[in-house]
């Protein structure tokens, strides 16, 4: 015997004990799939959450985080405080990155600078709390007699003295 409740569309619920009529979800509730026996209460975006998409009888509300916070977890289940670039969030709040580490985002942890020497390269630009180091050519590439990464200077035309 086919379950008549399976005919009930999203936005309705079916009470099997009654006439198997699909009744509309009550206010502030939804069913996003058909054949539901109950409707779910809409998510409320309060406090550090703000509404990105209103709830409807067929779909739940979607939340974002208010300014100064960012989403964590599936469907923005949590809001975490933003820090500045060059900082990370600890139990005691935002703390500057330790020397040798950086964070170029408002979220996440401080990560160690790249160790250029592991790739046989040298440090071209020093790292900061906000930026990773920039690795350049290896020290061997910069030694006398080695081919340079810079192109040779153009040859002077004959008969012209240097300016």
């Amino acid at each position: 015997l086919q379950d008549l409740c399976s005919n009930c569309p999203a936005g309705t619920f079916c009470d099997n004990n009654r006439s198997q009529i699909c009744s509309p979800c009550p206010p502030n509730s939804f069913s996003s799939a058909g054949g539901q026996r109950t409707c779910d209460i809409c998510r409320q975006c309060k406090g550090v959450f703000k509404t990105r998409k209103e709830c409807s009888s067929t779909s739940n509300a979607e939340c974002d985080c208010i300014s100064g916070y960012h989403c964590l977890g599936a469907e923005c289940s949590m809001c975490e405080q933003d820090c500045k670039q060059g900082q990370e969030l600890t139990k005691k709040g935002c703390k500057d990155c330790c020397f040798g580490t950086f964070n170029d985002q408002k979220r996440g942890i401080c990560r160690p600078w790249t160790n250029c020497s592991l790739d046989g390269k040298s440090v071209l630009v020093n790292g900061t709390k906000e930026r990773d180091v920039v690795c350049g050519p290896s020290p061997a590439d910069l030694s006398p007699g080695a081919s340079s990464a810079t192109p040779p200077a153009p040859a002077r035309e004959p008969g012209h003295s240097p300016q």
């Epitope: 309705t12 699909c22 009550p26 509730s29 409807s56 009888s57």
Partner: antibody
Framework: DVQLVESGGGLVQPGGSRKLSCAAS????????MHWVRQAPEKGLEWVAY????????YYADTVKGRFTISRDNPKNTLFLQMTSLRSEDTAMYYC???????WGQGTTLTVST | QIVLTQSPAIMSASLGEEITLTCSAT?????MHWSQQKSGTSPKLLIY???NLASGVPSRFSGSGSGTFYSLTISSVEAEDAADYYC?????????FGGGTKLEIK
């Protein structure tokens, strides 16, 4: 701001037909079921018809079954009520209502009389 | 069909008075909604699923009940509360409204 604006009411002869419309704005119309509810002069409220968000489920009050047809055009955010074989007892203010019953239109008056 | 009977049909109350409107159903319903209709305007949702206040509704309104008996209470009546009040159920088809209670302010 959520708005429901009904139109199409007026004076109709008994046995005649009329089509009411309800223009919705300010919310995701295609995500909500919709009702028509009516109120006869100096009387209470009476549920008339319901249509689910995707039009797959439709119900009518016994008093209008076989004479009224509810439909919707989601791309145009519009709800309709086609009424035929009208009787004097269909005289009422007709409201379009979101399925949560939290928003009602201002209503359109239908008078069935000779 | 489930018939909803509201009582009293007309009620007169003084400002500041606490009043209770009742709605009884001929069969058990899962929950009840209440709407308010002021003269010449559309109805407005007041209480949903028995006891939840709709958006923007003052906290002096409250709802309770279960099964076949539900009530709406106004803890301290104000002049702006003069209106018709309807209970309605949307769980058992056909969906029905009560006959209404007219609240007059003395």
């Amino acid at each position: 701001d959520v708005q429901l604006v009904e139109s199409g009411g007026g004076l109709v002869q008994p046995g005649g037909s009329r089509k009411l419309s309800c223009a919705a704005s300010g919310f995701s119309f295609s995500s909500f079921g919709m009702h028509w509810v009516r109120q006869a002069p100096e009387k209470g409220l009476e549920w008339v018809a319901y249509i689910s968000s995707g039009s797959s489920t439709i119900y009518y009050a016994d008093t209008v079954k076989g004479r009224f047809t509810i439909s919707r055009d989601n791309p145009k955010n519009t709800l309709f009520l086609q009424m035929t074989s009208l009787r004097s007892e269909d005289t009422a203010m007709y409201y379009c209502v979101r399925d949560w019953t939290d928003y009602w239109g201002q209503g359109t008056t239908l008078t069935v009389s000779t | 069909q489930i018939v909803l009977t509201q009582s009293p049909a007309i009620m007169s109350a003084s400002l500041g008075e606490e009043i209770t409107l009742t709605c009884s159903a001929t069969s058990s319903v899962s929950y009840m909604h209440w709407s308010q209709q002021k003269s010449g305007t559309s109805p407005k949702l007041l209480i949903y699923t028995t006891s939840n206040l709709a958006s923007g509704v003052p906290s002096r309104f409250s709802g309770s009940g279960s099964g076949t008996f539900y009530s709406l209470t106004i803890s301290s009546v104000e002049a702006e509360d003069a209106a018709d009040y309807y209970c309605h159920q949307w769980t058992t088809y056909p969906w029905t409204f009560g006959g209404g209670t007219k609240l007059e302010i003395k």
